[in-house]
């Protein structure tokens, strides 16, 4: 099975790795801009230069292309939490990220916000933090782990999800009440 | 057993409103975030907005900030998500999720869904 190719992939293909098809001529192929670059206007003709223009501020291109505008730098999200790691350039766009100790997580593909490593008080680190990953903690004995924290054993209530991981304490307190009675 | 029941879908003109609702039960509800997730015909599921255990934080994705609000009510233990101005495109089946955070899935409970059809 041959796999379906837009009318953009059909053109390209016909001609040599770093060109493109003349869009009004099929007998020419054009030379690419180089990123960092657009398409101004197309080759006039064989062997001659296509007309390529730098991207202006706050636009770029990342790889060879014939496109007639750059692309728009992305911007960071503040309400996300994420911050600058690069600025945007001709050729590279924005590069965004977290905070030192945050870890990132996706809503979407590609639309992350960022969120505070937990830093396994009332327990050991079993995992160190990660770009994509918050710290996997083991928590003490007494504790219970809720949203990965270690929380105290005093905080869980009968038949909640602690109810097992806290099962001394709580039968401790069960025969305190016991005993208390006649 | 963590249960999500959803309730308030149905059918709605362009422009109108509806509230849905979830109520939870088997889990500590003020603990974790919790919020909508949506899956609209022949398309996958996709995070609507999200809110923390105390309320204090809130996502929305960016085709529905503005016109849908997220709230809970942690003594009842219910999650709701008003949404007005409706529009054809957010037709789609309506999951009540407990988020997840930290890596991995991107929730670990999701009740049955509720059905919010938007059309003339």
């Known amino acids: 099975l041959v796999p379906h190719l837009g009318d953009r992939e059909k053109r390209d293909s016909v001609c040599p790795q770093g060109k493109y098809i003349h869009p009004q001529n099929n007998s020419i192929c054009c030379t690419k801009c180089h990123k960092g670059t657009y398409l101004y206007n197309d080759c006039p003709g064989p062997g001659q230069d296509t007309d390529c223009r730098e991207c202006e501020s706050g636009s770029f291109t990342a790889s060879e292309n014939h496109l007639r505008h750059c692309l728009s730098c992305s911007k960071c999200r503040k309400e996300m939490g994420q911050v600058e790691i690069s600025s945007c350039t001709v050729d590279r766009d924005t590069v965004c990220g977290c905070r030192k100790n945050q870890y990132r997580h996706y809503w979407s593909e590609n639309l992350f916000q960022c969120f505070n490593c937990s830093l396994c008080l009332n327990g050991t680190v079993h995992l160190s933090c990660q770009e994509k990953q918050n710290t996997v903690c083991t928590c003490h004995a007494g504790f219970f782990l809720r949203e990965n924290e270690c929380v105290s054993c005093s905080n869980c209530k009968k038949s909640l999800e602690c109810t097992k991981l806290c099962l001394p304490q709580i039968e401790n307190v069960k025969g305190t009440e016991d005993s208390g009675t006649t | 057993e963590v249960q999500l029941l959803e309730s308030g879908g149905g059918l709605v003109q362009p422009g109108g409103s509806l509230r849905l609702s979830c109520a939870a039960s088997?889990?500590?509800?003020?603990?974790?975030?919790m919020g909508w997730v949506r899956q609209a015909p022949g398309k996958g599921l996709g995070w609507v907005s999200a809110?923390?255990?105390?309320?204090?934080?809130?996502y929305y994705a960016d085709s529905v900030r503005g016109r849908f609000t997220i709230s809970r009510d942690n003594s009842k233990n219910t999650l709701y998500l008003q949404m007005n101005s409706l529009r054809a495109e957010d037709t789609a089946v309506y999951y009540c999720?407990?988020?997840?955070?930290?890596?991995?899935?991107?929730?670990?409970?999701r009740g049955q869904g509720t059905l919010v059809t938007v059309s003339s």
């Open positions: 809110i923390s255990g105390s309320g204090g934080s809130t």
């Open positions: 999720a407990k988020v997840k955070l930290g890596g991995g899935p991107n929730f670990d409970y």
């Open positions: 088997g889990f500590t509800f003020e603990w974790y975030w």
